[in-house]
């Protein structure tokens, strides 16, 4: 005659928390709390986050979803992943650009802007490390070029061009005398 014994629910546990009168089961990620449960250990009334909002974790008390962030066009940011009900927009830099943090102690949530990556080829240098999280790391001069000051200078193609010591070392095969 007695009803089936309900499973024990611990208000201090992960699945149930006291919301209002009762311990209620939380809302899943991507849902917000419309109304708490109306019986001990019951299910709360949960609704899907509206467009352009999200909640990333199971929650018990969020009665509204967080607004999705907009990527900062002024900082040349682009959306790497669009916002969904369960995850915020992931902003980053388009290919050929890298993240330059705006604070010294840089973490994933730090403000940043996008900088165009150095084009090692245009500088006549080898690409030692491709640009992604930081700027491109350029290496030594490409064949046919030698170090001169901060740049790479093309080996002379005729005896008319002067060829200092470093030039001679790299471009010796081109020298006529």
């Amino acid at each position: 005659q007695g009803g089936t014994r309900s499973p024990r629910c611990d208000c201090a546990g992960d699945f149930h928390k006291k919301i209002g009168l009762f311990c209620c089961r939380g809302c899943p990620a991507g849902h917000y709390l419309k109304a708490p449960c109306t019986e001990p250990c019951g299910n709360s009334t949960c609704l899907v986050c509206p467009q352009d909002t999200f909640l990333a974790w199971e929650n018990h008390h969020n009665s509204e979803c967080a607004r999705c962030q907009a990527c900062d066009e002024q900082a040349s940011q682009v959306a790497l992943e669009n916002c969904s009900a369960v995850a915020d927009t992931r902003c980053g830099c388009k290919p050929g650009w890298f993240v330059e943090c705006q604070v010294s102690q840089c973490v994933s949530s730090s403000p940043f802007y996008c900088q165009p990556c150095l084009d090692c080829g245009a500088l006549h240098r080898h690409t030692r490390l491709l640009c992604s999280r930081r700027d491109t790391d350029c290496g030594t001069c490409l064949p046919g070029f030698y170090e001169h000051g901060d740049g790479c200078v093309s080996c002379p193609t005729s005896t008319l061009g002067s060829c200092p010591e470093r030039c001679a070392a790299v471009c010796g095969w081109r020298q006529m005398f």
């Epitope: 007695g2 009803g3 089936t4 014994r5 309900s6 024990r8 629910c9 208000c11 006291k18 919301i19 209002g20 009168l21 009762f22 311990c23 708490p36 109306t38 019986e39 001990p40 250990c41 019951g42 008390h61």
Partner: antibody, heavy 123, light 111 residues
Framework: QMQLVQSGGGLVKPGGSLRLSCAAS????????MSWIRQAPGKGLEWVST????????YFPDSVKDRFTISRDNAKNSLYLQMNSLRAEDTAVYYC????????????????WGRGTLVTVSS | DVVMTQSPDSLAVSLGERATISCRAS??????????MQWYQQKPRQPLKLLIY???NVESGVPDRFSGSGSGTDFTLTISSLQAEDVAVYYC?????????FGQGTRLEIK
């Protein structure tokens, strides 16, 4: 000792509004859920609303949802029932109750009741 | 909603005799081994009084001639030896789930 003193009842026309108050004393008001129960003339008891302690969530039956609001002012040890869009069928004596929680089962019983205040909805 | 049905609607018992009032719920009001139901007494011009909670626990200050029993869906309030001051209307009520619901009441009189 424990007391729940009610006020705010009276005669109101259909579609009108009324605000009931319940002043509590003799216990730590903020630690208890509180309810309103009503009793139509010559009829039984009907639950009208409950407000939780702490986070002040409110609950209503369908018969009054979207017309009634319950609120509490813990600083003033007071409970309120704002009744809008009143209908003839809302005519009743309204009781304020203290809801005591028993054990870890999240189980409530109305352990103290006010004397009631009469609300008459009539044109 | 959980419907609570009391029987009888009215009852006349001689002083010193046993009075029994029944209450049936339309579904179980049991939770975690406890029956979430109570009994109240209503006398004219007095606040209602909680007599029994969790089906069988007598509220402090209530005379021990009052007792409650039952589980699941069927419950009983018993007054072992009726006294003149017990003339009142008695209500059962469930707290298993919202909306909280009451029985229609049983009027107890002296025969």
């Amino acid at each position: 000792q424990m007391q729940l003193v009610q006020s705010g009842g009276g005669l109101v026309k259909p579609g009108g509004s009324l605000r009931l108050s319940c002043a509590a004393s003799g216990f730590t008001f903020s630690s208890y859920a509180m309810s309103w129960i009503r009793q139509a003339p010559g009829k039984g008891l009907e639950w009208v609303s409950t407000i939780s302690d702490g986070d002040s969530y409110s609950y209503f039956p369908d018969s009054v949802k979207d017309r009634f609001t319950i609120s509490r002012d813990n600083a003033k040890n007071s409970l309120y029932l704002q009744m809008n869009s009143l209908r003839a069928e809302d005519t009743a004596v309204y009781y304020c109750t203290r809801d005591r929680i028993y054990g870890s089962v999240q189980y409530y019983a109305m352990d103290y009741w006010g004397r009631g205040t009469l609300v008459t909805v009539s044109s | 909603d959980v419907v609570m049905t009391q029987s009888p609607d009215s009852l006349a018992v001689s002083l010193g005799e046993r009075a029994t009032i029944s209450c049936r719920a339309s579904e179980s009001v049991e939770f975690s081994g406890t029956s979430l139901m109570q009994w109240y007494q209503q006398k004219p011009r007095q606040p209602l009084k909680l007599l029994i909670y969790a089906a069988s626990n007598v509220e402090s200050g209530v005379p021990d001639r009052f007792s409650g029993s039952g589980s699941g869906t069927d419950f009983t309030l018993t007054i072992s030896s009726l006294q003149a001051e017990d003339v009142a209307v008695y209500y059962c009520q469930q707290s298993r789930k919202l909306p909280y619901t009451f029985g229609q009441g049983t009027r107890l009189e002296i025969k």
